[in-house]
Interface confidence: medium
């Protein structure tokens, strides 16, 4: 019969014959022959292959370098790579999460609209009229000005986006 020019799924063509690919988690040791099956071996510890393959070497698991602010989110297996994420207070610089940067703080006059996650930075928003933030923080939202009226006081000093109002006693009318 004619030698094949294409092979079925999970097979590969070598020396004019179709050999089985190695399953995920295993690497190729020797190609099949007319008389023998493809020989595969499991990947070693800290190695993986995530596809049906004919690789002679497994890939090393990703190292989550704590010096780059990384930690293991999901431990790798023989079929999957390790997934890294950032330490609390940091977020990934890319989708691959190869390194982390510090979450930004929101300056006075700005509050946290959305707290940062392992993959996204802090989102700040300017404090609208009636709200303020007097600190630089990665956690603090804009907070409403104190209501002097509810304390039976009057506004002595108007609030800003960075300062609360200052309340004081009402002036008593003299007879």
């Amino acid at each position: 019969p004619e030698p094949p020019t294409a092979c079925r799924e999970k097979q590969y063509l070598i020396n004019s014959q179709c050999c089985s690919l190695c399953q995920p988690g295993q690497k190729l040791v020797s190609d099949c022959t007319e008389f023998t099956e493809t020989e595969c071996l499991p990947c070693g510890e800290s190695e993986f292959l995530d596809t049906w393959n004919r690789e002679t070497h497994c890939h090393q698991h990703k190292y989550c370098d704590p010096n780059l602010g990384l930690r293991v989110q999901q431990k790798g297996t023989s079929e999957t790579d390790t997934i890294c994420t950032c330490e609390e207070g940091w977020h990934c610089t890319s989708e691959a999460c190869e390194s982390c940067v510090l979450h930004r703080s929101c300056s006075p006059g700005f509050g946290v609209k959305q707290i940062a996650t392992g993959v996204s930075d802090t989102i700040c928003e300017p404090c609208p009229v009636g709200f303020f933030s007097n600190v630089s923080s990665a956690f603090e939202k804009c907070h409403p000005w104190t209501s002097c009226e509810t304390k039976d006081l009057v506004v002595q000093q108007a609030g800003t986006n960075k300062t609360d109002v200052v309340c004081g006693p009402q002036d008593r009318l003299r007879a």
Epitope: G69, G89, V135, S136, S137, F139, E140, K141, H143
Partner: nanobody, 119 residues
């Protein structure tokens, strides 16, 4: 010199309570984000809770939400962690930390206080 000194750890039965304190000095405490982190025996660091400078905004790890409460007294330069309904898996050394303002993970750490939950 910046110093963070934790206290209040100890041995407690499951379901019990403890209150940790962290006395801070050497920096402007009332302007700093603060947090508690912990390290269980043989495990890595785990973030527990964070609090904003004014103490108005607090955040918790899912594992402690509803059981732990972070608070602060800026007039006393002290950070607190009230721990209720303690479980065996809460056993760890607890550290208070000043949140980072540089590429360091945390600017400063305390020496930690050991919490052991066991019957």
């Amino acid at each position: 010199e910046v110093q963070l000194l934790e206290s209040g750890g100890g041995l407690v039965q499951p379901g019990g309570s403890l209150r940790l304190s962290c006395a801070a000095s050497g920096f402007t405490f009332g302007e700093s984000d603060m947090k508690w982190v912990r390290q269980a025996p043989g495990k890595g660091l785990e973030w527990v809770s964070s609090i904003s400078p004014n103490g108005w905004d607090t955040y918790y790890a899912d594992s402690v939400k509803g059981r732990f409460t972070i608070s602060r007294d800026n007039s006393k330069n002290t950070l607190y962690l009230q721990m209720n309904s303690l479980r065996a898996e809460d056993t760890a050394v607890y550290y208070c930390a000043k949140s980072p303002s540089s590429r360091l993970k945390f600017d400063y750490w305390g020496q930690g206080t050991l919490v052991t939950v066991s019957s």
